[in-house]
């Protein structure tokens, strides 16, 4: 389905002239940033961005690739090198340390320099690195963490925790030796390392004593609290601040976010990770867009500004399952959250970054026709005379043999949210990929986001833009609308 106007060179020349005009008018915003927002698409490599763009366009009944994502409107773009100190292809822990703390670390370690060793508790002390969120708090800003995963998961933990093992969600996940050596589980660090104003995501079970029934699934013992120390971390957190509120469902979140007496808000909407957007119960669980809006509502009350981390954390999980439908619908919701944040903030005083921690071995190819479903088949057959999809994986659970051969695939199969795209190599879980990822930037000092950079550069851009340590002598004019 080729739009007739696109056959005319004038269409492309006019479009390019408009883009050139906009580019020539583009002026860097040279003031400091009052607010910092980092949107982290976990596993959102460039192939995922492209496929999500097409899906979002097709959701709007358009052909697909011509329809811009919210992040496509950001004027500055760079590439980020995602390798960790010890691996060509990183995980979400080492990468979170880079883009949130400004220092690269080792695989599976969080908030620690590469002098720390995975799983070795005694290498923690002295190797801690401080996140931009922590520095923003010290500067008097309000801070928040929003994610569709557990709030104790690797990416959000990079904002507040220091641990040699990303899997130490609660004390029950730690060996006794590590506990005895004084290492703290991530849930404990969430409430004790620093004062976080807004915490929204999943991860209820790591906050409550072992056997404590979950409010949403009281008869499912697998969702019970897991803590061996018997602590109620939510209660401890609430006791720290008079205006603190804890919520566990969408209705309570909406009420709390509109209540002027609420100064601190913790919302934990699932025992573990939040549900995929396609499985979410919209009466019980908020979407990422709704959580983002609630966080911004609370944080923007602070005249000194805020720091907000927002993660579309389950893009990554969909890819690990080799289920592109799940990954891409998560990516579209992630973009919806970016769009909403753009409506609620001003680029004059808010630096907004959008990036990924790493990519996935997810490919989009095979010459599909324009306007064909993103989940559809390639136009021809493969050498084995069977159909194949435009979306594929380099490895993962999508590798299946049927009578010793690759199975055929139909369009009615490939569109299912449960369908696993085929893979070249059999693995229980599809893996991350090592190519560079995009960084999109808008707002004060966004022009610094350019070229090909180390992933750790991202944290430094945020710190500099907001004149946070170590850039307190940033020599930038105050943010738009401020008078001091």
């Amino acid at each position: 389905i080729i739009p007739v106007e696109e056959e005319n060179p004038d269409f492309w020349n006019r479009q390019a002239a408009e883009a050139l005009g906009a580019a020539k008018k583009l002026q860097p915003i040279q003031t400091a940033a009052k607010n910092l927002i980092i949107f982290l698409g976990d596993g959102m490599g460039v192939s995922t961005v492209t496929a999500a763009r097409i899906l979002k366009g097709q959701k709007e009944d358009k052909l697909g690739p011509e329809t811009p994502l919210a992040m496509d409107h950001f004027p500055y773009v760079a590439l980020s090198k995602t390798y960790s100190v010890d691996k060509h292809v990183p995980d979400s822990a080492a990468t979170a340390t880079a883009y949130l703390c400004g220092v690269k670390g080792n695989f599976q370690t969080i908030g620690l320099s590469a002098a720390a060793r995975y799983n070795q508790c005694n290498t923690t002390r002295g190797n801690e690195v401080v996140s931009v969120m922590n520095r923003a708090k010290k500067a008097g800003k309000s801070v928040g963490v929003v994610t569709t995963t557990r709030v104790q998961h690797a990416s959000p933990a990079g904002a507040y925790a220091h641990t040699v093992n990303r899997n130490w969600y609660s004390d029950a996940n730690m060996p006794g030796s590590a506990r005895r050596e004084g290492c703290k589980d991530i849930a404990t660090q969430l409430i004790s390392n620093m004062d976080i104003d807004v915490i929204l995501g999943g991860g209820r079970k790591y906050m409550f004593r072992m056997g404590a029934p979950d409010p949403e699934y009281p008869h499912d013992y697998s969702q019970d609290g897991t803590r061996m120390d018997g602590k109620n971390l939510v209660q401890e957190w609430l006791a720290k601040q008079q205006g603190a509120r804890y919520v566990w469902n969408r209705t309570e979140l909406m009420q709390a976010s509109l209540d002027p007496s609420v100064t601190h808000l913790m919302g934990l909407f699932e025992p573990g990770d939040m549900k995929y957007e396609i499985h979410r119960d919209p009466t019980l669980d908020p979407s990422l867009m709704e959580m983002t809006e609630a966080a911004l509502r609370l944080l923007s009350r602070n005249p000194r500004g805020f720091f907000l981390f927002v993660e579309g954390g389950r893009i990554d999980h969909g890819h690990h399952e080799s289920r592109a439908y799940r990954a891409l619908t998560e990516a579209v919701m992630f973009d919806d959250a970016i769009e909403r944040a753009g409506q609620l903030t001003s680029e004059e005083d808010t630096l907004t970054l959008v990036t990924a921690d790493h990519s996935h071995v997810f490919s989009f190819g095979a010459y599909p026709l324009r306007g064909s479903s993103i989940f559809g088949l390639a136009p021809g057959k493969a050498q084995d005379r069977k159909a194949y999809t435009a979306l594929l994986y380099g490895n993962g659970p999508g590798y299946v043999l049927k009578d010793g051969a690759r199975p055929d695939v139909t369009e009615s199969e490939s569109g299912s949210p449960e369908y696993r795209q085929q893979a070249a190599v059999p693995l229980d879980e599809e893996t991350h990929a090592g190519e560079d990822v995009a960084v999109f930037a808008r707002g004060p000092q966004a022009h610094l986001v350019h070229g090909v950079q180390e992933q750790s550069f991202i944290a430094h851009v945020m710190a500099f833009a907001a004149c946070l340590e170590p850039y307190t002598a940033c020599d930038l004019a105050p943010p738009a609308g401020t008078t001091d």
Epitope: L55, G57, Q58, K59, E60, D61, K62, L63, G64, P282, T283, Y325, T329, G371, S372, S373, I374, F375, G376, E411, S412, S414, G415, S416, P417
Partner: nanobody, 121 residues
Framework: QVHLVESGGGLVQAGGSLRLSCAAS????????MGWFRQAPGKEREFVAA???????EYADSVKGRFTISRDNAKDTVYLQMNSLKPEDTAVYYC???????????????WGQGTQVTVSS
């Protein structure tokens, strides 16, 4: 998840009419494009019609001018009004849902169980 339940099928004479309904279970029904497919005995399932959330509509050439697809977002229901039915329209008719008209007309995410339509001559 979206659960789809079709109704309205039956036996009708050539030249007659039927109205199929498909009720969807998900609250965000209006975000989905909805479609109808059919499968005649011994043949592959084929696309019939689809309607996007924005109201964009597509029909298969074989039913243009005879069939009309519509939706009622308040009732989470999509309809297929079938007029001037022919014996070759005999098939099991399936309701489908997907993220946009392009997706639903080619690779639907969700399917109903189907309802039988038989057109006698």
């Amino acid at each position: 998840q979206v659960h789809l339940v079709e109704s309205g099928g039956g036996l009708v004479q050539a030249g007659g009419s039927l109205r199929l309904s498909c009720a969807a279970s998900r609250r965000s029904f209006s975000e989905y494009a909805m479609g109808w497919f059919r499968q005649a005995p011994g043949k592959e399932r084929e696309f019939v019609a689809a309607i996007g959330w924005s109201g964009v509509i597509e029909y298969a050439d074989s039913v243009k001018g005879r069939f009309t697809i519509s939706r009622d977002n308040a009732k989470d229901t999509v309809y297929l009004q079938m007029n001037s039915l022919k014996p070759e329209d005999t098939a099991v008719y399936y309701c489908a849902a997907g993220l946009g008209i392009r997706v639903v007309s080619q690779t639907p995410a969700y399917w109903g169980q189907g309802t039988q339509v038989t057109v006698s001559s």
